[in-house]
């Protein structure tokens, strides 16, 4: 998103039709001034997956060329604000997080690829990306709108043991019953076929000439 | 509660050098970016510099870039100014203030100050 | 380095007034950083209001801020004996984080 400073001239700029080339310079010249601050873009809403897993892109519009960059994961809840986590890269550089930290990301440009890690129904929140653009001097400060992360804990699952037993029987009761099926099946088939047994394939000539190649067999049935 | 207290001021000739120290409580100070904030007599507020947590990053206003070097020590909870090459504008009373925490750094919490009179 | 222009210089008004004060900047500052203070004679500044409109720990609903880009304004609904001082408006979304040159709020 623009600056505000840049949507207000271009308002201006819209009703100066007539004067248009000195209302062009102004706002070329102006255009710097007016844009020094930093925004800071992330998506309004994710959803968890149901391996506790939010992934999200945080993009901002650098006011300067920045070679250190920190961005910092922040969780608001019930007006309470907690740090999720911190890194500081360079630009070109991997994004790198503590060991211990449940976030990983990715950087691209102005673009950083945040994916937050074992989060549970409890963790839901509005998730703040803040960026700071750290060196070379001025310092720019960047605070995104947040994005609430929803997190559903799917049901407990039961224990392991237990459930492999349980696949086990399912898989045999399967097994057997396809067994079971196929052997009926075929019984059916062979007592439906038996008058049908005794007969012979006899080869007969083709209808059409170009055809040569083509058999067409005809079953003659014996008495 | 916070408690930030500023010492080191006085009476300073022009070129001297002098430093100030800020000894914080009530906080965990190494979570926390530390600013230095001065008042000319009868003046207005004018920021200083700012030093972050881990101390890696310094900041400075353009007046005193060069002159003034701020520093921390995270395991006594102390910041430092150290003030060298002092003109008679650098007569104020010096802040020492906290950065309020996550949102940026506008200032939650203030020293009382110390007066630096510099003067022939 | 942003300017900030405090408007206007004195305000002399009486308690139980509504008090409008301005904060102009010379570029555009995101809404998110900026704050105001109150400044009391030998006291040290008390934080009022961040990220423009987020009032700081313990500050009466009387005092509010609006504006974005490079208008902002300090409300403060009713004056009480207590709030007459100087108030000071300041950047922080890039450095050097610049102060306004203030205005006097004065019983009238």
């Known amino acids: 998103m623009a600056c505000l400073g840049f949507q207000r001239h271009k308002a201006q700029l819209n009703l100066a039709t007539r004067t248009w080339p000195c209302t062009l310079l102004f706002f070329l010249l102006f255009i710097p001034v007016f844009c020094k601050a930093m925004h800071v873009a992330q998506p309004a809403v994710v959803l968890a997956s149901s391996r506790g897993i939010a992934s999200f892109v945080c993009e901002y519009a650098s006011p300067g060329k920045a070679t250190e960059v920190r961005v910092t994961v922040l969780r608001q809840a019930d007006s309470q604000v907690t740090e999720v986590c911190a890194a500081t890269y360079m630009m070109g550089n991997e994004l790198t997080f503590l060991d211990d930290s449940i976030c990983t990301g990715t950087s691209s440009g102005n673009q950083v690829n945040l994916t937050i890690q074992g989060l549970r129904a409890m963790d839901t929140g509005l998730y703040i990306c803040k960026v700071e653009l750290m060196y070379p001097p001025p310092y720019y400060l960047g605070i995104g709108n947040g994005t609430q992360i929803y997190v559903i804990d799917p049901e407990p699952c039961p224990d392991s043991d237990f459930l492999l037993w349980i696949l086990a029987a399912v898989s045999s009761g399967l097994f057997f019953y396809s067994f079971l099926l196929t052997a009926v099946s075929l019984s059916k088939m062979l007592k439906k076929r038996s008058p049908l047994t005794t007969g012979v394939y006899v080869k007969m000539p083709p209808t059409e000439p170009e055809c040569e190649k083509q058999f067409q067999p005809y079953f003659i049935p014996i008495n | 509660q916070v408690q930030l207290v500023e010492s080191g001021g006085g009476v300073v000739q022009p070129g001297r050098s002098l430093r100030l120290s800020c000894a914080a409580s009530?906080?965990?100070?190494?979570?926390?970016?530390m600013h230095w904030v001065r008042q000319a007599p009868g003046k207005g507020l004018e920021w200083v510099a700012v030093?972050?947590?881990?101390?890696?990053?310094?900041y400075y206003a353009d007046s005193v870039k060069g002159r003034f070097t701020i520093s921390r020590d995270n395991s006594k909870s102390t910041l430092y100014l150290q003030m060298n090459s002092l003109r008679a504008e650098d007569t104020a009373v010096y802040y020492c203030?906290?950065?309020?925490?996550?949102?940026?750094?506008?200032?939650?919490?203030w020293g009382q100050g110390t007066l630096v009179t510099v003067s022939s | 380095e942003i300017v900030l222009t405090q408007s206007p210089g004195t305000l002399s008004l009486s308690p139980g007034e509504r008090a409008t004060l301005s904060c102009r900047a010379s570029?555009?500052?995101?809404?998110?950083?900026l704050a105001w203070y109150q400044q009391k004679p030998g006291q040290a500044p008390r934080l009022l209001i961040y990220?423009?409109?987020s009032r700081a720990t313990g500050i009466p609903d009387r005092f509010s801020g609006s504006g974005s880009g490079t208008d902002f304004t300090l409300t403060i609904s009713r004056l009480e004996p207590e709030d007459f001082a100087v108030y000071y408006c300041?950047?922080?979304?890039?450095?050097?984080?610049?102060f306004g040159p203030g205005t006097k709020v004065d019983i009238k």
């Open positions: 203030s906290r950065g309020l925490l996550w949102f940026g750094e506008s200032l939650d919490y």
């Open positions: 300041q950047q922080y979304g890039s450095s050097p984080f610049t």
């Open positions: 990220g423009a409109s």
């Open positions: 570029q555009s500052v995101s809404s998110s950083y």
């Open positions: 030093i972050w947590y881990d101390g890696r990053n310094k």
């Open positions: 009530g906080f965990t100070f190494s979570n926390y970016c």
